[in-house]
Amino acid sequence: RQQWELQGDRRCQSQLERANLRPCEQHLMQKIQRDEDSYGRDPYSPSQDPYSPSQDPDRRDPYSPSPYDRRGAGSSQHQERCCNELNEFENNQRCMCEALQQIMENQSDRLQGRQQEQQFKRELRNLPQQCGLRAPQRCDLEVESGGRDRY
């Protein structure tokens, strides 16, 4: 790869490390769970295992009264915070893609089945536009099986 690309990747990585993408993850999960609610499915089956602070201590999240509040209160708050974070990547489409990939990876082991994964992916692709930002043209959101190691 070109040297300038590698240097850009390092700077992108620095931004990704500093970004708080939790509000994006929460906003999207609430969104797809609301959609499922309207089809009569309970998003809070015991297998759902929503985030707790102790599970993800490097992403302190002061905003959420309860994980993925199913009434949707606070979802617009999550979306606003999410958009503020994504705005940092507006002028670097490759880095925007990496931010979306990281959101996908962080949530991949919480998505129940292929259908929910596809729905999450679809909403994730639309996220930049929802924020009034340019969406990256080519962005592979497939999660490799090795990308699910979580501490």
């Epitope: 590698l6 390092r10 700077r11 620095s14 931004q15 490390e17 962080n106 990308g147 190691d149 979580r150």
Partner: antibody, heavy 115, light 113 residues
Framework: QVQLVQSGAEVKKPGASVKVSCRAS????????INWVRQATGQGLEWMGW????????GYAQKFQGRVTMTRDTSINTAYMELSSLTSEDSAVYYC????????WGQGTRVTVSS | DIVMTQSPDSLGVSLGERATISCKSS????????????IAWFQQKPGQPPKLLIY???ARESGVPDRFSGSGSGTEFTLTINSLQAEDVAVYYC?????????FGQGTKLDLR
């Protein structure tokens, strides 16, 4: 809370290799790069290179090219730095640091090279 | 490689006074795509690993007292410690992570006068 715990002190003979480990906890290991930095006694900080736990990609300072190898084992959230063909000049404290900007550091591993 | 040059090499400041450390980079470390300067400041006390104080030139790391501040852009940067405390005695390093190899300044030793 975030912790980086490094392996213990090492004494090596010239020409030998040393492998230092850095066990991470309290965060999503794959999301943050690991940097390795060394410091000889009474000297400043010297950046050696970086490694991405997610991809395994690495980048090394020219000075260490061909002599250093940075790897990771994501199943145990551990990064490794191996330095070969040691000389007395390599005697130093070796640090791992989390993140491109060095947000958190390990306690350091003293490596002494002596015949 | 980007060379980071700190000044002074050592500095003596009285308790409660202001300490100012300068760092110059041999080329700009401002990324125009996001308007961020990729420079950090570290504090190191004897026998301890370095501690991050400031990243992106002026963003204070969480838990760092607000008497520490960073400023500057492009090639010239400053770390300021207002109202110096006894526990601030240490060596301070600037660090660029704009391009590899990442590089540190030579360090500034801060002592009480």
């Amino acid at each position: 809370q975030v912790q980086l715990v490094q392996s213990g002190a090492e004494v090596k003979k010239p020409g030998a290799s040393v492998k230092v480990s850095c066990r991470a906890s309290g965060y999503i290991f794959r999301n943050f790069d690991i940097n390795w930095v060394r410091q000889a006694t009474g000297q400043g900080l010297e950046w050696m290179g970086w490694m991405s736990p997610k991809s395994g990609d690495t980048g090394y300072a020219q000075k260490f090219q061909g002599r250093v190898t940075m790897t990771r084992d994501t199943s145990i959230n551990t990064a490794y730095m191996e330095l070969s063909s040691l000389t007395s000049e390599d005697s130093a404290v070796y640090y791992c640091a989390r993140g491109v900007d060095g947000t958190n550091w390990g306690q350091g591993t003293r490596v002494t090279v002596s015949s | 490689d980007i060379v980071m040059t700190q000044s002074p090499d050592s500095l003596g400041v009285s308790l409660g006074e202001r300490a100012t450390i300068s760092c110059k980079s041999s080329q700009s470390i401002l990324d125009n795509s996001n308007n961020k300067n990729f420079i950090a400041w570290f504090q190191q006390k004897p026998g301890q690993p370095p501690k991050l104080l400031i990243y992106w030139a002026s963003a204070r790391e969480s838990g760092v007292p607000d008497r520490f501040s960073g400023s500057g852009s492009g090639t010239e940067f400053t770390l300021t410690i207002n109202s110096l405390q006894a526990e601030d005695v240490a060596v301070y390093y600037c660090y660029q992570y704009y391009s590899t190899p990442h590089t540190f300044g030579q360090g500034t030793k801060l002592d009480l006068r």
